[in-house]
């Protein structure tokens, strides 16, 4: 009965996310088979978060969107170990929004979830940001110094990276 | 007073090129992102190309892209537009424009008087 | 590539009356509270002058009989009250995505 009835929950919960995610891909999270953890299918995991590159080309307003019509939002970088994991999927002679603007062009930058700005956790080319009037943030590859942020022109269309929470069942 | 003057448009045969050029006075060009607008004779509007204030990034649509190079020199208050392989359809009024930033947006705030291309054999 | 589309094509309206031009995107523009819609005022022979910013922000300069309304995919330029002067060809263009468009433009004239 007991198992039955998480059963039911487990099968309510996934229905909900289905109009997003119509497959996930579940692992057993500890020694619990009660705990699952899931994120959608192609996305990659890391710690508790799910991730996806999106490949179209859109600028950073509709990148957004587009995170946000799957439950997600641009990615918001907190570590040095969640950037290199991103950086494992990602092609280097393409350009990736982050979920990091300057809407106001004053230097104020800010996250799309709210975390706050951390200037001892940001991993900007070397003499980037240099532009007022570029108030969206990129990753990209440069090949003296490896993978990092710059700030370009929100409406440029580039790729992206989507993240939210791992989805637990 | 803001001011952009355009120059070097002229007649070209197609397969041809041009270097326009825009010299701007009235601000401090160097931290300006500046554009290229054209317009075709009795038509509409349209966006040619971006250079952002450093020279670094430039922007094209799809119609230009490969054709032409945005630049700009910012020790001479110049910006340039060298057009290449051009076809009749370049044929317009060559418009350099002020970018100013509007949150995730931008108007175009400043408009020279335009140079005319004429692609034309 | 975002398109825009203006109507009517020309307009003639009398002096003192009500002037108004619709802009349509085929998709939103808008974005936390912003519509990236601009519009410029072409007169024979000149530049565009720029005369609204984000769809209702009138620019530095520009009498305020000019007017700028809408969001989402739907815009309106407003003249409350036709002057002479205000003969000319006038331009919707969105900025939230590069290729950056203009609507076709809408000739205003005076009947």
């Known amino acids: 009965n007991f198992m039955y009835s998480k059963t039911v929950k487990r099968l309510s919960k996934l229905r909900e996310y289905q109009q997003y995610h119509p497959s996930l891909t579940c692992v057993m999270e500890g020694k619990d088979i009660e705990d699952w953890s899931c994120c959608p299918t192609p996305w990659t995991s890391f710690q508790s978060s799910c991730y996806f590159i999106s490949t179209g080309m859109q600028s950073w307003t509709k990148s957004q969107k587009n995170c946000s019509v799957m439950g997600a939002d641009l990615v918001v970088i907190n570590t040095r170990e969640e950037q290199d994991f991103i950086i494992q999927n990602l092609k280097r002679n393409s350009s990736y929004f982050l979920g990091l603007s300057d809407p106001g062009g004053r230097r104020h930058w800010q996250w799309v979830d709210q975390t706050p700005y951390n200037e001892n956790v940001t991993f900007w080319h070397s003499g980037e940001p240099n532009n007022l009037d570029e108030r969206c943030a990129i990753i990209n590859f440069r090949s003296s110094e490896e993978w990092g942020w710059n700030d370009i022109h929100c409406h440029v269309p580039q790729k992206s990276i989507c993240k939210m929470k791992k989805i637990y069942i | 007073e803001v001011q952009l003057l355009e120059s070097g448009g002229g007649l070209v045969q197609p397969g041809g090129s041009l270097r326009l050029s825009c010299a701007a006075s009235g601000f401090t060009f160097s931290t300006y992102t500046m554009s290229w607008v054209r317009q075709a004779p009795g038509k509409g509007l349209e966006w040619v190309s971006t250079i952002n204030s450093g020279g670094d990034n430039t922007y094209y649509p799809d119609s230009v892209k490969g054709r032409f190079t945005i630049s700009r020199d910012n020790s001479k208050n110049t910006l340039y537009l060298q057009m290449n392989s051009l076809r009749a359809e370049d044929t317009a009024v060559y418009y350099c424009?002020?970018?100013?930033?509007?949150?995730?947006?931008?108007?175009?705030?400043?408009w020279g008087q335009g140079t005319t291309v004429t692609v034309s054999s | 590539d975002i398109v825009l589309t203006q109507s009517p094509d020309s307009l003639a309206v009398s002096l003192g009356e009500r002037a108004t031009i619709n802009c349509k995107a085929s998709?939103?523009?808008?974005?936390?509270?912003?519509?990236?819609v601009n519009w410029y005022q072409q007169k024979p022979g000149q530049p565009p002058k720029l005369l609204i910013y984000?769809?209702?922000n009138l620019e530095s300069g520009i009498p305020d009989r000019f007017s700028g309304s809408g969001s989402g995919t739907d815009f309106t330029l407003t003249i409350s009250s036709l002057q002479a002067e205000d003969v000319a060809v006038y331009y919707c263009q969105q900025s939230d995505e590069d290729p950056w468009t203009f609507g076709g433009g809408t000739k205003v004239e005076i009947k």
């Open positions: 998709q939103s523009v808008d974005y936390d509270g912003n519509s990236y």
């Open positions: 424009a002020t970018y100013r930033p509007y949150y995730y947006g931008s108007v175009l705030d400043y």
């Open positions: 984000g769809a209702s």
